[in-house]
């Protein structure tokens, strides 16, 4: 009985020959756990992990802090990949995360982290980030140092509020943020003087609900 | 749908007056922050002053201070500006946003720009002779 290939990212499926745009079975190394995850094989030379994806509002992002770490929604369209895959996958070499944004106008934007990292679950998954380039705004949106996720049933935050409830949506909230690309999804001509809409401040400002995000992952390296 | 409405700017003489009212319709004041802010030709916005009017707290600028006062009318959802001995460094187009009053870090007193998610359109206040 051969071997089972398994793959831990979508550069590990690149680099076996598998350059096309599609949702792979990822597992990590020493584990029998599998995740369902999309790849984008054409964007930036391909091999990108798509860990998040917002696109039409079919899909409900305000969940319990157990969803956010298995994961939820649909990889061919609005999902969650799962911060206990992300916070492991991490932490067993340099990832870069690139954040694609569409704005309601047609314009598109993108941050670029060189190095991303999950905290584990017993840190409540908090964000590390360095090294921010792009065109989606010179400073971060998400705040740095990096805070600790929180939901609807897990208040992580630095705020008196409960950011999660209030703005909706898991995030790395601070007191709250200057974004939080899980919020409520709003369609066009509705998206504006919003206070729990996917925002990214240093690209459209307070209030602005964009049209589509994307927060995709990538060996360093690559 | 949230919207704010400023009002009550012009042109006005250095030393002299002017009152900024914001009109604010879609929340209710007793939840919410509201700050005025300022951007002059080729400058960032800034933050002018604010009011929470559920506990009557309000913040100046160190520029402003002693020079202009906010208030609110809960019963006219609206929230004013006296601007008093202004000078041509005043010279701004003037906005008022708000933000749930609940969004304050532990230990802060007042909110970033960013957390101010409703916005209105603006009023210029110039200030020449």
């Known amino acids: 009985k051969g071997e089972q290939i398994s793959f831990r990212d979508c550069a590990e499926v690149f680099k076996s020959g598998h350059t096309t745009n599609g949702v792979y079975t990822l597992t990590l190394p020493n584990s029998t756990e599998e995740v369902k995850a999309y790849c984008d094989m054409e964007a930036g030379g391909g091999g990108w992990t798509i860990i998040q994806r917002r696109e039409d509002g079919s899909v409900d992002f305000q969940r319990t802090w157990k969803e956010y770490k298995v994961g939820f929604g649909n990889p061919s369209g609005e999902y969650w990949l799962g911060n206990e895959f992300v916070s492991q996958l991490t932490n067993q070499q340099r990832y870069v995360l690139k954040i694609h944004l569409k704005d309601w106008e047609g314009n598109e934007a993108y941050s670029l982290y060189e190095h991303f990292y999950l905290s584990s679950e017993e840190l409540n998954y908090r964000i590390h980030l360095k090294g921010l380039t792009g065109t989606a705004g010179k400073i971060s949106s998400i705040s740095q140092p990096g805070n600790d996720f929180s939901t609807k049933d897990a208040d992580n935050d630095k705020c008196i509020c409960k950011c999660s409830q209030m703005l909706t949506g898991g995030w790395w909230f601070d007191a709250c943020g200057p974004s939080n690309l899980n919020g409520m999804y709003y369609p066009q001509r509705q998206n504006t003087n919003k206070f729990n809409g996917i925002k990214w401040y240093y690209w459209k400002g307070s209030g602005y609900s964009l049209k589509g995000t994307t927060m995709m992952i990538r060996p360093a390296g690559f | 749908e949230v919207q704010l409405v400023e009002s009550g700017g012009g042109l006005v003489q250095p030393g002299g007056s002017l009152r900024l009212s914001c009109a604010v319709s879609?929340?209710?004041?007793?939840?919410?922050?509201i700050g005025w802010f300022r951007q002059a030709p080729g400058k960032e916005r800034e933050g002018v002053s604010a009011?929470?009017?559920?506990?009557?707290?309000?913040y100046y600028a160190d520029s402003v201070k002693g020079r202009f006062t906010i208030s609110s009318d809960n019963s006219k959802n609206t929230v004013y500006l006296q601007m008093n001995s202004l000078r041509p460094e005043d010279t701004a187009v003037y906005y008022c946003?708000?933000?749930?009053?609940?969004?304050?870090?532990?230990?802060?007193?007042?909110?970033?720009?960013?957390?101010?998610?409703?916005w209105g359109q603006g009023t210029l206040v110039t200030v020449s002779s």
């Open positions: 009011i929470r009017s559920s506990g009557g707290s309000t």
């Open positions: 879609g929340i209710t004041l007793d939840d919410y922050a």
């Open positions: 946003a708000a933000v749930p009053a609940g969004r304050l870090r532990y230990g802060e007193q007042w909110y970033p720009i960013y957390e101010y998610d409703a």
